[in-house]
């Protein structure tokens, strides 16, 4: 049953909002999709979760949520925010999740984000962000997840990422990025997932992924690459790689030599004509390999060390004979 304290909590519930105890004697407040144009004023100091998404909030005043020192998650997605002032999140010492997606922000709200030392997840996707200031994430030492997809970025904000050594997942998909320079993610040694799909990437620095020592998932699908991304060779923990729907014509010898942990490679919808015979060697975790329309392949690929394939598809190639060892190489 509810304790006397939970009754006190629920009396601090703003009009029309839905409130419930969170099990720790704090309050979850859902004020989403109510047509609000400003923040509710009578919030309980014991609020741990506040959902203000899908409203008509167009501006935040400095210090609009005073005394919410227990607030851990703040959702402001789907509003009409164009700017967030300095001090908008002052006093939110416990804030771990901040959702600002689907607004009309043009810049990362640098000053407002300062000193959110507990922040672990930041959603800035689906805005109009074209510029990420160099120091905008400098105080976010706990940040684990960062969404910057579906914005208007034309380049990787290299300097801004330097302070995010704890980051584990990031998406920069659905932007207008055209090039990834050397050491673009050089300090992101904890990053496990990186999404770069649906950009305009046509060139990669030879060392653009250097420093990503924990990376397991890399998504380069739907870009304009016309050469195989050899920069992946430093990604020794890579498990899932996507570069389908690009303009890559060949996969070189020893293509995945630095990626022995690969389980999945998606590279369909590329005009691949040539595949180096040694390209898929020493991939013991690889389960599926599909090579369609590689017309310049004349020899069956050497699958030495790639012993756990469950599915191999080769169409449109010029292979005239199979090596005697092919049945030994496959399970």
């Amino acid at each position: 049953g509810s304790s006397p304290r939970s009754g006190v909590l629920l009396r601090g519930c703003p009009t029309h909002c839905h409130c419930e105890p969170d099990g720790r004697m704090l309050l979850r407040v859902d004020c989403s999709d109510l047509g609000l144009s400003e923040l509710p004023s009578n919030l309980s100091v014991f609020t741990s979760y506040l959902d203000l998404s899908m409203n008509n909030i167009s501006q935040l005043l400095p210090n609009p949520l005073p005394s919410l020192r227990f607030l851990e998650e703040l959702r402001l997605a789907g509003n009409a925010l164009t700017y967030i002032p300095k001090g908008a999140f002052t006093g939110l010492y416990s804030l771990k999740v901040l959702m600002l997606q689907n607004n009309q922000l043009r810049h990362v709200p640098t000053e407002a984000l300062q000193n959110l030392r507990s922040l672990q997840s930041l959603r800035l996707d689906a805005n109009h962000i074209s510029y990420v200031p160099p120091s905008c994430f400098s105080g976010l030492h706990s940040l684990r997840h960062l969404w910057l997809d579906d914005n208007a970025l034309t380049e990787i904000p290299v300097q801004a990422f330097r302070s995010l050594s704890a980051l584990q997942a990031m998406t920069l998909a659905l932007n207008k990025i055209h090039h990834i320079p050397d050491y673009a993610f050089g300090n992101l040694s904890s990053l496990v997932v990186l999404h770069l799909h649906n950009n305009r990437i046509h060139s990669l620095g030879k060392k653009c992924f250097d420093g990503l020592h924990s990376l397991e998932t890399l998504d380069l699908n739907y870009n304009n690459l016309d050469e195989f991304p050899t920069a992946i060779r430093t990604l020794s923990n890579l498990k899932e790689l996507g570069f389908h729907s690009n303009n890559i014509r060949s996969i070189p010898e020893k293509a995945f030599v630095g990626n022995p942990s690969l389980i999945t490679i998606h590279f369909y919808d590329n005009p691949i004509q040539f595949v180096g015979r040694s390209a898929f060697q020493h991939l013991p975790e690889l389960r599926t390999l599909t090579l369609n329309g590689a017309s310049q392949i004349t020899e069956f690929p050497d699958l030495t060390g790639t012993a756990n394939l469950e599915s191999l598809t080769l169409t449109g190639a010029q292979i005239s004979s199979l090596p005697q060892t092919v049945c030994n190489q496959l399970p």
Epitope: P134, E155, I156, V158, Q159, R162, P181, D182, Y183, A184, G186, N187, K206, K207, D210, G211, H213, T230, R233, T234, L235, S236, E253, K254, V257, G258
Partner: antibody, heavy 118, light 111 residues
């Protein structure tokens, strides 16, 4: 603990070749570039070239390109520098180093003295 | 090639005093906001040791009396309070473009 251990000192005649080795331990060998740098007696440091072990990715200082070959064997985590057509001005300590944070050279071998003398 | 020029060639500083070494590149070594300039310390008979990377970032384990600053073409290494163990030759290095190049070195001694 990251370590780079180089082969011992060499004395060579002019026109000969030398091959210096650099055995790495304490990290994933194929995930970092190995750089080669030399230092003539009493002089400064000069970059020779680099390799990403396991791949065919190498870069050379144009000054050495025709005489230098850098290779690596991932099975033994060892990188090699071979310099041919030796001359007296090649007398130097040759260092291997790991390309670390943003390409800075964060770990170095102890150096290999190559003396070229007739 | 990018030419790195250090000044002065040698420097004598009293214990506890500040030592400042300058390094100038013949062209900018900045790219996407990063300055690809690093500083090393070399003591006699030893390989160089990384002190500072990307112009101003202290390498792990390096005492905080060492600091770096600068961008573009002009960079500075500062030892805020010189200790006896800091006697060495200091080198700057750029890896903005091949061939990577070093300064000629600055010898730091105790006055």
């Amino acid at each position: 603990e990251v370590q780079l251990v180089q082969s011992g000192a060499e004395v060579k005649k002019p026109g000969a070749s030398v091959k210096v080795s650099c055995k790495a331990s304490g990290y994933t060998f194929s995930a970092y570039w190995i750089e080669w740098v030399r230092q003539a007696p009493g002089q400064g440091l000069e970059w020779i070239g680099e390799i990403l072990p396991g791949s065919d990715s190498t870069d050379y200082n144009e000054k050495f390109k025709v005489r230098v070959t850098i290779t690596a064997d991932t099975s033994t985590s060892t990188a090699y520098l071979e310099l041919s057509s030796l001359r007296s001005e090649d007398t130097a300590v040759y260092y291997c180093a790991r390309g670390g944070h943003y390409g800075s050279l964060d770990y170095w071998g102890q150096g290999t003295l190559v003396t070229v003398s007739s | 090639d990018i030419v790195m020029t250090q000044s002065p060639d040698s420097l004598a500083v009293s214990l506890g005093e500040r030592a400042t070494i300058n390094c100038r590149a013949s062209e900018s070594v900045d790219n996407y906001g990063n300055s690809f300039m690093h500083w090393y310390q070399q003591k006699p008979g030893q390989p160089p040791k990384l002190l500072i990377y990307l112009a101003s970032n202290l390498e792990s384990g390096v005492p905080d009396r060492f600091s770096g600053s600068g961008s573009g073409t002009d960079f500075t290494l500062t030892i805020s309070s010189l200790q006896a163990e800091d006697v060495a030759v200091y080198y700057c290095q750029q890896n903005y473009e091949d061939p990577f190049t070093f300064g000629q070195g600055t010898k730091v001694e105790i006055k």
